[in-house]
Amino acid sequence: KKVVLGKKGDTVELTCNASQKKNTQFHWKNSNQIKILGIQGLFLTKGPSKLSDRADSRKSLWDQGCFSMIIKNLKIEDSDTYICEVENKKEEVELLVFGLTANSDTHLLEGQSLTLTLESPPGSSPSVKCRSPGGKNIQGGRTISVPQLERQDSGTWTCTVSQDQKTVEFKIDIVVLAFQKASSTVYKKEGEQVEFSFPLAFTLEKLTGSGELWWQAERASSSKSWITFDLKNKEVSVKRVTQDPKLQMGKKLPLHLTLPQALPQYAGSGNLTLALEAKTGKLHQEVNLVVMRATQFQENLTCEVWGPTSPKLTLSLKLENKGATVSKQAKAVWVLNPEAGMWQCLLSDSGQVLLESNIKVVPTWPTPVQP
């Protein structure tokens, strides 16, 4: 007997072929011998089966000896053995209908778990194999669980249900609600304007929620809330902002914050959280601010950085067009009695310059002795 797998809500064609390519009498019945459809003359007739209103046949194919039955909007309970009676012979087709659904909303926060449940007909023993958009393979039986969703799990999951060497494929769209980046660092010279951007890794028709940026300055003993805001249908409105610093926020997505000037006392790290309406949990993005200052005081040329820097970063003072260089894996470098000229302070990571500041050292003339 032929086995056909179908998907819940889908349409399936059960084929039945006669040896002679001509119009002939045929009937489709279920395992209880209840007539579903058949022909009387040229007319398609329907029987008392529950399926009848969803069953059809293609008249144009009858001349080719093809007496298929098409079942629309498949239900799990349509799983049965169907019998096609044509030319005094009986053809049996076993239809198995499966459904695969996500237990929760398909819009999930990063870190949350996803459970896919398989609906299957009694007596079947299917196996399920799912592949994430990122290429992760997960296998299971009646349920498939993904304990901690990651950003790269966003997209179309392809799940293959196998039974009796036959397969049927399901596609489920999963949206992982997260920021595009888990963390980002902004490098600025003292006094420069700072732009923080928090792009989302998803798009929703309506996006409503509230958020806050907490800031831990390197020089401060505790963190403080710099800004709180509301998000309504992708429109941003500020609720509360500190007086120092006076942050500005863009009214449209992506979330965008402007700090008028980078100062050493602002250097540090922040955590932007976004709570979305009707979702439990929050989206997080860490942001770091590194500030550089180059100063000359009397006979001392100093370059300093504040904020979260990794120990492998190098801070250098270099005289332009000259070989004179002072480098340290530290947060401050200095040169005593620097030569006159344009000095560069460089913060670099494995030779890649992250931040630079130029300072001009003017020649110092001896002070004339008073007569």
Partner: antibody
Framework: QVQLQQWGAGLLKPSETLSLTCAVY????????WSWIRQPPGKGLEWIGE???????NYNPSLKSRVTISVDTSKNQFSLKLSSVTAADTAVYYC?????????WGQGTLVTVSS | DIQMTQSPSSVSASVGDRVTITCRAS??????LAWYQHKPGKAPKLLIY???SLQSGVPSRFSGSGSGTDFTLTISSLQPEDFATYYC?????????FGQGTKLEIK
């Protein structure tokens, strides 16, 4: 709600090959047949041919020698190729879902054949 | 091929009128017939299938009848949005064929 979206080149020179694609959104792809129908300016509708998800085709004998309909089940798409076009092939081309009746239809693509 | 012949090729009527369009098949097609409404620049829309079954969402002022070779589409009380071209189609055998169309115009 099933929707059919179609696209392809709108201007061809005689002897070129017409190529159109139709994507099916929001509904079952298997179990149905997928058709191409055309309507020359000021004339009636003409059925070109059909295909199902497994690639089984039926063509209008009047066009059979020049027509190829193919299917890409991974994308829920089907395509029409009509070779050696002439001015007589200028028409609005529609894709449609069919068991016995055509429903729904794509929005239509005007294809003009002109030298 | 089965030839489908519609009459009249055009008809003028007013809002509220009752209009009947006929379709004749060149051979017996039982009730394997559909009716479509087509407006300029739009896709055709299925109105009636299996000769007399009303497609879901289609107003009840549309009705179909007939069997064998002769079929009719009736609009009981014309509405402004009904002015369009109407086609019949046979699904009895390949190739599927359509009538040449009946243009329904405002009088």
């Amino acid at each position: 709600q099933v929707q059919l979206q179609q696209w392809g080149a709108g201007l061809l020179k005689p002897s070129e090959t017409l190529s159109l694609t139709c994507a099916v959104y929001g509904g079952s792809f298997s179990g149905y047949y997928w058709s191409w129908i055309r309507q020359p300016p000021g004339k009636g509708l003409e059925w070109i041919g059909e295909i199902n998800h497994s690639g089984s085709t039926n063509y209008n004998p009047s066009l059979k020698s020049r027509v190829t309909i193919s299917v890409d089940t991974s994308k829920n798409q089907f395509s029409l190729k009509l070779s050696s076009v002439t001015a007589a092939d200028t028409a609005v081309y529609y894709c449609a879902r069919v068991i016995n009746w055509f429903d729904p239809w794509g929005q239509g693509t005007l294809v003009t054949v002109s030298s | 091929d089965i030839q489908m012949t519609q009459s009249p090729s055009s008809v003028s009527a007013s809002v509220g009128d009752r209009v009947t369009i006929t379709c004749r098949a060149s051979q017996d097609i039982s009730s394997w017939l559909a009716w479509y409404q087509h407006k300029p620049g739009k896709a055709p829309k299925l109105l009636i299938y299996a000769a007399s079954s009303l497609q879901s969402g289609v107003p009840s002022r549309f009705s179909g009848s007939g069997s064998g070779t002769d079929f009719t589409l009736t609009i009981s009380s014309l509405q402004p949005e009904d002015f369009a071209t109407y086609y019949c189609q046979q699904a009895n055998s390949f190739p599927y064929t359509f009538g040449q169309g009946t243009k329904l115009e405002i009088k």
